[in-house]
């Protein structure tokens, strides 16, 4: 008799999820000498243990603590780049400027980037059919709780000047409901972080408006200032030229229009 299975609104676990996580772990620890000591089988076991046999709407940060412990990693606290709704450019930037780090440049972020996963209560099966959607089903699902946990820890570790890349093409450049707006902003430590510098990325070539004056950016500034952290904002009108300059700061085009 086929067993009844909960039908969720979101896509199911990414196919070959265990193999993908394990392969990513091996690759990451090979590339990053400081993480060579990590036992990837133990990492997978801890990852699996966070959600297997548990109701996918009843996951807690506590469930991920064994994984967090195994994935403990020190990144330079003054070289952190947060992002909101502009992941690809943030990753392009850290690929060029190798001394800066997004969450996905850390082991745990790298393992889970772009993946979906969930299990089922009381069975050791992974659900490849569907997983809970944050809005339509529940917020305490395995994926959302994972990102909330690692994002909080990443923000807590930051110091000095913290940078955040924001998407200037969106109606809410700063969105209080994004991971950045709801988790990271509130977990920056004022005793360690002096300044949050927002980089607003413009989408259109002809767009020369000062998006640092946008009401949502002013809202971000207000939140940050109330937390006794200075705020700075920069318009990046031509992200392509910006990346070029990061690659080649000596280039004369970093000053001129050419």
């Amino acid at each position: 008799v086929p067993r009844w299975r909960q039908q969720w609104s979101g896509p199911g676990t990414t196919k070959r999820f265990p193999e993908t996580v394990l392969a990513r772990c091996v690759k990451y620890t090979e590339i990053h000498p400081e993480m060579r000591h990590v036992d990837c089988q133990s990492v997978w076991d801890a990852f699996k243990g966070a959600f297997i046999s548990k109701h996918p709407c009843n996951i807690t940060e506590e469930d991920y603590q064994p994984l967090m412990k195994l994935g403990t990693q020190t990144v330079p606290c003054n070289k952190i780049l947060l992002w909101s709704r502009i992941k690809d450019l943030a990753h392009q930037f850290t690929q060029v400027q190798r001394d800066m780090f997004t969450l996905e440049d850390t082991l745990l972020g790298y393992l889970a980037d772009d993946l979906t996963w969930c299990g089922e209560f009381n069975t050791s099966k992974i659900n490849y059919q569907s997983c809970p959607d944050w809005r339509k089903d529940c917020s305490n699902n395995p994926v959302s709780v994972f990102w909330k946990t690692v994002s909080r820890r990443f923000a807590e570790a930051a110091c000095d000047v913290v940078h955040v890349m924001l998407n200037g093409s969106r109606s809410k450049i700063f969105d209080k409901n994004s991971t950045f707006g709801s988790v990271e902003v509130h977990n920056l430590q004022p005793e360690k972080v002096q300044t949050l510098e927002a980089w607003v990325i413009h989408g259109g070539r002809e767009d020369s408006r000062d998006l640092c004056q946008d009401p949502t950016i002013k809202e971000l500034e207000s939140i940050i200032s109330k937390r006794n952290i200075q705020f700075s904002c920069k318009n990046i009108y031509r992200p392509d030229k910006f990346l070029q300059c990061v690659k080649n700061p000596e280039d004369s085009s970093c000053t001129s229009e050419i």
Partner: nanobody
């Protein structure tokens, strides 16, 4: 509009050090590259150093290893630490700011650096 103000120039002996500062005021949200240029008497203005937001830096070959560019945590002041100065470093030093691919390009008035015994 952005205003740039340099300071820190002066007379120094060969082998000595100076630190130039540039303070930006006005629409500093449009500044994402900050740099230094110099112009010696009878010569063209030449690139010295540049720093991009996020910290990427570049230098001309003639100053590499001797000069260091940096910016403060507020982002509206940047510096040029000049060590092991040579007579050929004598010039008017201009700070520069901009936003690549746009018309936002700004210059300071310049500060004189003279290296002589």
């Amino acid at each position: 509009q952005v205003q740039l103000q340099e300071s820190g120039g002066g007379l120094v002996q060969p082998g000595g050090s100076l630190r130039l500062s540039c303070v930006a005021s006005g629409s500093i949200s449009n500044i994402i590259t900050m740099g230094w240029y110099r112009q010696a008497p009878g010569k063209q203005r030449e690139f010295v150093a540049r720093i991009i937001i996020g910290g990427s830096t570049g230098y001309s070959d003639s100053v590499k290893g001797r000069f260091t560019i940096s910016r403060d945590n507020t982002g509206n002041t940047w510096y040029l630490q000049m060590n092991s100065l040579k007579p050929e470093d004598t010039a008017v030093y201009y700070c520069n700011a901009g936003n690549p691919g746009t018309r936002y390009i700004y210059w300071g008035q310049g500060t004189q650096v003279t290296v002589s015994s």
